[in-house]
C-alpha cells in the first residue's frame, strides 16, 4: 500500500472521523431548517460540501473507486454520498436555470445519517428486505383491488351522478338546456337539493331500496360526481382509487353511504366483502410479511 492509502485507511477506521461526519450531517440538517438564512451561511454550505468531499476522497483512496469487490461504488450507501456531492457541485457551479428543483436534493444529506449510525443502518436494511418480500403480497393486493374495482365499475358506474332535481322550471327551460348551462356552484344550488351544510347535492337512486328525493324533487343523472368529481366508479382508475380507499379505511363510511344511497342497500354485501378481504385480511398480511422480515434481519 502507498503511504497515502495507509493514511486514508487510518483516518477511515478512526472513531473521531465517524464522529466528525455525524456532527457535520446533524449541523447541516439544522442549517437546512432555517427559514431565511443569513448570508454567512453560504460559506458554511461550502464547508459542509468540503467535508463531504473530503470524506468521499478518503473512502476512495482507502478502498478504491469502482474496480474490485469492496470499492467505494460497490457499497450502495456510498452511492448516496456520491449523489449528494455531485448535486452540491451542480447547484453551486453549473447554471441550470431553475435550480430550486435541484436544491431539493440537498435534503438527501439528512439521509447520510443512516449510513453513519449502525443501528439505523440495520433497521433500514430490514425495511428494504421487507419491501423485497412484500412484492408477492403487493401483486396479490393489486390483483384483488383490480378484481373488485372491475366489479364496482359494473355495479356502480355513473350512479354517483344521481341527484335530486327541482320540480319547477321556467317556461323556456328543459332538463337538457339546464345540463348545458350548469357551471357555477350557484347554478347547482339553484336546481338541486342540498342538505344543510353539505357541499354536494343530495344523492338518490332509481331502485326501490335506494335513496329517495324529498317532495318537489326528482332523481336525475346530471352533473359531476361528489367530492369535486373525485369520488366515483365511472372508470377503472377511479374505481381502483375508491377500492384503495376502502382497503385503507380512509373515510370509507362516506363512500359506503354515498354508494348505498345511489345504488341501493342490497349492495352493502359488496362493501362487507371488500372490508373483510381488503381491509382486515390483506392489510394484516402485509403487516405479517413486514414483521417476518424484521425478525429475519434481527436473527
Amino acid at each position: 500500500f502507498s503511504p497515502l492509502r495507509r493514511i486514508s485507511i487510518k483516518i477511515l477506521v478512526h472513531s473521531l472521523f465517524s464522529m466528525l461526519i455525524m456532527c457535520t450531517i446533524l449541523t447541516n440538517c439544522i442549517f437546512m431548517t432555517m427559514n431565511n438564512p443569513p448570508d454567512w451561511t453560504k460559506n458554511v454550505e461550502y464547508t459542509f460540501t468540503g467535508i463531504y468531499t473530503f470524506e468521499s476522497l478518503v473512502k476512495i483512496l482507502a478502498r478504491g473507486f469502482c474496480v474490485g469487490e469492496f470499492t467505494f461504488l460497490r457499497d450502495p450507501w456510498n452511492w448516496l454520498d456520491f449523489v449528494v456531492i455531485v448535486f452540491a457541485y451542480l447547484t453551486e457551479f453549473v447554471n441550470l436555470g431553475n435550480v430550486s428543483a435541484l436544491r431539493t436534493f440537498r435534503v438527501l444529506r439528512a439521509l447520510k445519517t443512516i449510513s453513519v449510525i449502525p443501528g439505523l443502518k440495520t433497521i433500514v436494511g430490514a425495511l428494504i428486505q421487507s419491501v423485497k418480500k412484500l412484492s408477492d403480497v403487493m401483486i396479490l393486493t393489486v390483483f384483488c383491488l383490480s378484481v373488485f374495482a372491475l366489479i364496482g365499475l359494473q355495479l356502480f358506474m355513473g350512479n354517483l351522478k344521481h341527484k335530486c332535481f327541482r320540480n319547477s322550471l321556467e317556461n323556456n327551460e328543459t332538463l337538457e338546456s339546464i345540463m348545458n348551462t350548469l357551471e357555477s356552484e350557484e347554478d347547482f344550488r339553484k336546481y338541486f337539493y342540498y342538505l344543510e351544510g353539505s357541499k354536494d347535492a343530495l344523492l338518490c337512486g332509481f331502485s326501490t331500496d335506494s335513496g329517495q328525493c324529498p317532495e318537489g324533487y326528482t332523481c336525475v343523472k346530471i352533473g359531476r360526481n361528489p367530492d369535486y368529481g373525485y369520488t366515483s366508479f365511472d372508470t377503472f382508475s377511479w374505481a381502483f382509487l375508491a377500492l384503495f380507499r376502502l382497503m385503507t379505511q380512509d373515510y370509507w363510511e362516506n363512500l359506503y353511504q354515498q354508494t348505498l344511497r345511489a345504488a341501493g342497500k342490497t349492495y352493502m354485501i359488496f362493501f362487507v366483502v371488500v372490508i373483510f378481504l381488503g381491509s382486515f385480511y390483506l392489510i394484516n398480511l402485509i403487516l405479517a410479511v413486514v414483521a417476518m422480515a424484521y425478525e429475519e434481519q434481527n436473527q
Partner: nanobody
Amino acid sequence: EVQLVESGGGVVQPGGSLRLSCAASHRQFIRDVFTGWYRQAPGKQRELVARIYNEGNTQYADSAKGRFTISRDNAKKTVYLQMNSLRPEDTALYYCLFSGTISTGREYRSGDYWGQGTLVTVSS
C-alpha cells in the same frame, strides 16, 4: 331506441276541440321530471304549450291558460292535452317531450326525449 308516440292531431274548426295523447312505448322510461307538449308553427320557434311534472303539478304557457288542460295516466304511461276553444293561431306541429331519465339496460341516462310530432290545423 327511445320512442314517444303522439296521436290525436288533425283538422278542426275554430272554437272546436282536440285531444292529443303521448304514449311512451317503451318501459325504458324510468322517471320524468316532466312530460310536456310543445308546438312549432311554420317559421316560428318551438315553444312550450303545457307540461305536467311527475308529482302532478302543471305549468301552462300564457296562450294556453284556461283553454288547454294537461293530464296523465301513469298506468298507461300516457300524457294527454285537451285543447278547447281552438283558434287559427294554434295551428302548428305539436311535439311531446319526455324530460327525465331512461334506462338503457346498462346505465341510466337523463335528458330530453322528443316525439316525432302531430299536426294540428285550425281552419274554417
